[in-house]
Interface confidence: low
Amino acid sequence: MMTGTIETTGNISAEKGGSIILQCHLSSTTAQVTQVNWEQQDQLLAICNADLGWHISPSFKDRVAPGPGLGLTLQSLTVNDTGEYFCIYHTYPDGTYTGRIFLEVLESSVAEHGARFQIP
């Protein structure tokens, strides 16, 4: 029986050229976290493995930094970074838990004026 829940930073916005922290937190379960995958759609960004530590996919090495904690920091943001991000917690014995974050990267002038967005 999977009892855990994932809390995420939800829908977030950041400005072009800036950085953002993606955070997920798994609670309400005693399952052991063996690994956390960070994915954009089903493209792998990074992995934090309990035994092997962090691995950042080569294509994202220049713009992705591990942490804080099990989170992920995206740097030098571009408008193309807008989209869905998933934290996938691999646990034993529960299996997998997935959290979703939507990031919108705004042009600097738009972000400065406090633009907000909605997910339909």
Epitope: L44, N49, H90
Partner: antibody, heavy 126, light 107 residues
């Protein structure tokens, strides 16, 4: 582009053996769990088993583990399926599939195949 | 083993129809479910991962829902290229198990 190309299929007599190969390209083979899945004509898809990225750990469907062995050669970017004591019911298309990056053996998502080859047909008949 | 009950086994529908395929598991698997599409002579293609997440490059008319033991794949408006066989796969427990497929045919 991820490519998985299976080979080694064909006609084999009951009781015989066959070794299937899967040539992988377009990704770092040694970073990924790999699996074999089969599909018999008119039957359900069946997961055969998987192998950890470094070859040190395997899982099998209980009904097949005594006859089938999965191995890999990371230097050759190749995955293998050794099938012994073949039976008519092993007639199927065999697919090589790739899972996610370096998932630990406790994580079931490792073999939840993301990429598939085109398959190779194995016919067991006298 | 976790048993997968996929229904219906076959379905006739027309272009533009809304179609729903269900997969029921014999025990709670959380969201550890994937949906695949397979066309004759082709390799299966991943549509949905984590029960609800659209795989990269998959049209938004496909959606997945459910958790625990009951899961649904919905195609909101069928297109000609959607006529194929659809499979669910659980990856919460070894051995991994598939549903037996739903063949979607043109009415």
């Amino acid at each position: 582009e991820v490519q998985l190309v299976e080979s080694g299929g064909g006609l084999v007599q009951p009781g015989g053996s066959l070794r299937l190969s899967c040539a992988a390209s377009g990704f770092t083979f040694s970073d990924h769990w790999m699996s074999w899945v089969r599909q018999a004509p008119g039957k359900c898809m069946e997961w055969i088993g998987n192998i950890q990225y470094d070859g040190s750990y395997t899982n099998y469907a209980p009904s097949l583990k005594n006859r089938f062995t999965i191995s890999r050669d990371n230097a050759k970017n190749s995955l293998y399926l050794q099938m012994n004591s073949l039976r008519a019911e092993d007639t199927a298309t065999y697919y090589c599939t790739r899972g996610h990056f370096r998932i630990t053996m406790a994580s079931m998502g490792a073999s939840a195949s993301v990429y598939w080859g085109q398959g190779t047909m194995v016919t067991v008949s006298s | 083993d976790i048993q997968m009950t996929q229904s219906p086994s076959s379905l006739s529908a027309s272009v533009g129809d809304r179609v729903t395929i269900t997969c029921r598991t014999s025990q709670d698997i959380g969201n550890s479910l994937r949906w695949f599409q397979q066309k004759p002579g082709k390799a299966p293609k991943l549509l949905i991962h984590g029960a609800t997440n659209l795989a990269n490059g998959v049209p938004s008319r496909f959606s997945g829902s459910g958790s625990g033991t009951d899961f649904t794949l919905t195609i909101s408006s069928l297109q000609p290229e959607d006529f194929a066989t659809y499979y669910c796969l659980q990856h919460n427990e070894y051995p991994l198990t598939f549903g037996c497929g739903t063949k979607l045919e043109i009415k």
